[in-house]
Amino acid sequence: IVLRPSRVHNSEENTMRALTLKDILNGTFSYKTFFPNWISGQEYLHQSADNNIVLYNIETGQSYTILSNRTMKSVNASNYGLSPDRQFVYLESDYSKLWRYSYTATYYIYDLSNGEFVRGNELPRPIQYLCWSPVGSKLAYVYQNNIYLKQRPGDPPFQITFNGRENKIFNGIPDWVYEEEMLATKYALWWSPNGKFLAYAEFNDTDIPVIAYSYYGDEQYPRTINIPYPKAGAKNPVVRIFIIDTTYPAYVGPQEVPVPAMIASSDYYFSWLTWVTDERVCLQWLKRVQNVSVLSICDFREDWQTWDCPKTQEHIEESRTGWAGGFFVSTPVFSYDAISYYKIFSDKDGYKHIHYIKDTVENAIQITSGKWEAINIFRVTQDSLFYSSNEFEEYPGRRNIYRISIGSYPPSKKCVTCHLRKERCQYYTASFSDYAKYYALVCYGPGIPISTLHDGRTDQEIKILEENKELENALKNIQLPKEEIKKLEVDEITLWYKMILPPQFDRSKKYPLLIQVYGGPCSQSVRSVFAVNWISYLASKEGMVIALVDGRGTAFQGDKLLYAVYRKLGVYEVEDQITAVRKFIEMGFIDEKRIAIWGWSYGGYVSSLALASGTGLFKCGIAVAPVSSWEYYASVYTERFMGLPTKDDNLEHYKNSTVMARAEYFRNVDYLLIHGTADDNVHFQNSAQIAKALVNAQVDFQAMWYSDQNHGLSGLSTNHLYTHMTHFLKQCFSLSD
């Protein structure tokens, strides 16, 4: 299946050129997407090319500048947020990144009615998180780990919490592990639908062991970065959820929401909070051994001013074959009756599907079914449910958007996207306005990405929001590689793969092969998306074949494949990459003396283990920021898949699955090990231990560290990294420079 059908081919071969590394590093062929910033059922905001914030009304066709670039520039604003009453805008500047999602910033409030910044009772700086209430213009913000409330932007703040302390107590924002591995947000506070209540999490990290690493900077002495970071088996954060009435915050103060008894009996996590109405909230909890999740629906008791979570409104989700959920436990989408909800979880055949829960999980009505998976519920209206799945034509690496009519019986299903731009677009996401009056579709490929606006009732396309015309024109004289997505059937396992082939690929010739691997639980690498990246360059210019393979442990193909790796990470993921390589060799166009593997993060772990598998298949390989032992990685992530590193649980496999245990096996491969010294996520410790084991085994290897760089190796380090890896691979494959 050739996946670049939208490319316009220039018949004059001599005007075509191959991709260069410089093209990739400069982002020459990057694409744009258009996600409307919805502010109503028919209006959205968008930042224009000249940085004006423009309001568009789809129904009336009106558009106008709500905030000028001049105002934005006056405070060097890089972001904005309109209050729901449209009286104020917050302007965000001095962005300072912390971890994956978190950052601090300075906030200014601009009054749209008089065209001036609000003076008096200005916000402190830097703020860790700030947001408007869903209606009106109340503000909640987090400063120095405490939560504050303003009834109006110019009012003095009301302090909600007082116990916040750096690295100890976090209010309204997550600590490191909750941010990275559980919430996947920078915030841990949630307004009720009409802004009456504010719910927030408090994380107590007092007893959590601290990871410390040097940040070299420019000073005479390096700084030490300290992060409370629970590694596998270590003491975890203690979480509590509180709710405060924002109309009369001083009246009774924050009220704690009770934890379900079956959860509170041992270590547990809070996983998400969903407001249903102003006086009903849904909390999800998870046992530390992450195969039991409890969804608890709580109601406000006016008489006691407390939150009541009756046992009859507790819904248990349990996995007997793996962990609960996919990567995360799914969140509920409530229907209009404010008690029943839709949720994705495994059906009896082990495929993740949408279920409708009215009273108990046992009596759930299955809404979708089949040997494919429902992936995301976008929106539920009174008569429709919009979701994405990989059902169409049985390609797990595709995403199409479907509408199920829930207002009629039996419910009818319609694929909204399957036939829109079939060759160009097979991987969609969507963004819905209030009540799904309109929606934007963002197609990521396999052709050049395109974003379109649609009517929520008829699904009619209204207009193209972004079609990447400049990119399309720029690619007209580029010899892009060919891509195909196919599958291998091996011992009752289906291994989907993506192969990236040189432009003048000839099956009768032999090519060097590079395997790019991630392979982490519930991940997916083989996707029908557009990309012009480093591996595109390696195929286009350097004549390599690149392959990506989704083996056991990967997502969206059923629980059998997903949960195969449960409690034994580092075994089947590696086996399946090796199996695929053997199959590729059988295809006849791979030079079996020139095969390499590379990966980043979990992929660095898999590539290291593959190189040390003793198969003799790989000549060389690269591991960027690899995990080397699961005892070094975060508790929430690691224990989800591995259990605890204790004798009576799974310590043996923790020990057996390290990279260090296989140090001897690196003797016959060329190994390049790369890591940032300021990696807060996969600590430099991981690579330090690999290096130590290799030195102790007297095994030669190559290494590169990036001083003061985190897990992303961004900025100039990116250029250096890819240049360095290119040289390494070209040397390995005996390709001339």
Partner: antibody
């Protein structure tokens, strides 16, 4: 406190053009938060939305009147105006200018109204 | 356009009575509904917005309820100053449309 005041002739002949102006005081018409609207009410009948305008001049007209309506804005005078062409007796009404306030998610209500001006179409 | 239908079109009541006016939308408008009171020769005055939120300064005897297509304005104990015409208005879809009005008269 925001105030709106309609002005214009109270009598217009059939087939001519009705012209009204709304003067805004106590606030700026250049406020980018809101639209400015015209609404009318025939004697003894209900209210009908005519159209709106933003400070930038961007307009929307009720489809039922679209072919005959023009709304314009003059930010220097803090005014916006209505022109309704080819009037008939059916256009006899009290004409109000109004401004909404927003609650959330685009949910708005008309919080500010002029006192209204009666325009009679008669020869 | 969304049609707004009020009932009754008029009603007679006494001071102290509980009065209920209903408004039906031709399609679902969620809670995008407002209620106004209009006295002769005056502009409409906002009472209730977003179906159930009481506008500041409006007496608490006025209340609103409903969602989707059916809405109610209730005056718990009618006062002499409440004799007027009441209009509902939707802001869910453009153009905004009003009900034809309900006239509350003295019995």
């Amino acid at each position: 406190q925001l105030q709106l005041q309609e002005s214009g002739p109270g009598l217009v002949k059939p087939s001519e053009t009705l012209s009204l102006t709304c003067t805004v005081s106590g606030g700026s018409i250049s406020s980018s938060s809101y639209f400015w609207a015209w609404i009318r009410q025939p004697p003894g009948k209900g209210l009908e939305f005519i159209g709106n305008i933003y400070y930038s001049g961007s307009t929307y007209y009720n489809p039922s009147l679209k072919s005959r309506v023009t709304i314009s804005v003059d930010t220097s005078k803090n005014q916006f105006s209505l022109k309704l062409s080819s009037v008939t007796a059916a256009d006899t009404a009290v004409y109000y200018c109004a401004r909404p306030s927003y609650y959330g998610s685009g949910n708005y209500y008309f919080a500010f109204w002029g006192q209204g001006t009666l325009v009679t179409v008669s020869s | 356009d969304i049609q707004m239908t009020q009932s009754p079109s008029s009603l007679s009541a006494s001071v102290g009575d509980r009065v209920t006016i209903t408004c039906r939308a031709s399609q679902s408008i969620s809670s995008y509904l407002n209620w106004y009171q209009q006295k002769p020769g005056k502009a409409p005055k906002l009472l209730i917005y977003a179906a159930s939120s009481l506008q500041s300064g409006v007496p608490s005897r006025f209340s609103g309820s409903g969602s989707g297509t059916d809405f109610t304005l209730t005056i718990s104990s009618l006062q002499p100053e409440d004799f007027a015409t009441y209009y509902c208005q939707q802001s869910y879809s453009t153009p905004p449309t009003f009900g034809q009005g309900t006239k509350v008269e003295i019995k």
